[in-house]
């Protein structure tokens, strides 16, 4: 990487290196030969998360309830607010600017991973021996009924959407 004129946590201004402001503070005035960099803390609704020379702090993110958002972690002078989604919703992006309802797994599919505030439902096809006959955001694929354990026989084969149908054993020879 190219050479730099200053130390780490400094910046070059007027041919002189000045200290950057620490996280949580903004720049008021550059240093001079005789004075240090002047910095001021960010207000309660603002933050700066790096060593910086910003003259304005960034506003904390607003978790808009109209978009299904709620506060997961309140911001500080050094960190932004973290939003998450209300129950039954998940973020549309990593920055979580809006929420959409969790999807349901259609019949023939089961829930592999239940949705969270930041991730959608993950569905998987029901393998042979399993089925799902409902549209659900929670239900896993269920195993076919075992007719043998009930002393019954399979009368109708199961599918990925239907259970087997059991019936009595045929006594005729």
């Amino acid at each position: 990487e190219p050479p730099t004129a200053c130390r780490e946590k400094q910046y070059l201004i007027n041919s002189q290196c000045c200290s950057l402001c620490q996280p949580g503070q903004k720049l008021v005035s550059d240093c001079t030969e005789f004075t240090e960099t002047e910095c001021l803390p960010c207000s309660e609704s603002e933050f700066l998360d790096t060593w910086n020379r910003e003259t304005r702090c960034h506003q904390h993110k607003y978790c808009d309830p109209n978009l299904g958002l709620q506060v997961q972690q309140k911001g500080t002078s050094e960190t932004d607010t973290i939003c998450t989604c209300e129950e039954g919703l998940h973020c549309t992006s990593e920055s979580c600017e809006s929420c959409v309802p969790h999807r349901s797994c259609l019949p023939g599919f089961g829930v592999k991973q239940i949705a969270t505030g930041v991730s959608d439902t993950i569905c998987e096809p029901c393998p042979v021996g399993f089925f799902s006959n409902v549209s659900s955001a929670f239900e896993k694929c269920r195993p076919w009924t075992s007719c043998e354990t009930k002393d019954l026989v399979v009368q109708q084969a199961g599918t990925n959407k239907t259970d087997v149908v059991c019936g009595p054993q045929d006594r005729q020879r």
Epitope: A5, C17, S19
Partner: antibody, heavy 126, light 107 residues
Amino acid sequence: QVQLVQSGAEVKKPGASVKVSCKASGYTFTGYYMHWVRQAPGQGLEWMGWINPDSGGTNYAQKFQGRVTMTRDTSISTAYMELNRLRSDDTAVYYCARDQPLGYCTNGVCSYFDYWGQGTLVTVSS
Amino acid sequence: DIQMTQSPSSVSASVGDRVTITCRASQGIYSWLAWYQQKPGKAPNLLIYTASTLQSGVPSRFSGSGSGTDFTLTISSLQPEDFATYYCQQANIFPLTFGGGTKVEIK
């Protein structure tokens, strides 16, 4: 007391590499930048660059960019300077030098060297 | 890069003499300047920093002055152990640069 002890003299062929070590004692190694300065026979002092032993961050003089690598091992309080593709005009005494403490400086880089290693003579000759 | 020009390159003086060495920067460096003394076969030794602050343990016959581009190192009364080469160094921005040196020799 503060001491910087460097590795011994080296004789290298042109095109080879050399790695010089600088073992620090008597102070908190990670609290001060370490610089490397060289001096060709009968010549003046030439700054090569620095390493921040705390972060591992480095800054090299343009002249040595791409040829020099400064590293450190905090577990043994030792800084290293490796110079590649050696030429005959790299023949010099190489010094490590301790800077002022981190956070000492608010304006300027104020890099003044209060402690120096004893120097390592690197001779490049075919 | 900031060029540091020292003068004279050498000076012959006697014990007890007052010796003055000057250093000029190619651009303003405020007071970010150091002076070093180096004896043959030895590492440099810090004498003065921030143009005029005497390093701990350095005799008071050494003094520094100046600001901006022009700086001076003065040895008020030269002692036998002061015969050496002296270097100035700017500490305003990287890359750090040194003057070419001034050799103080016995007359």
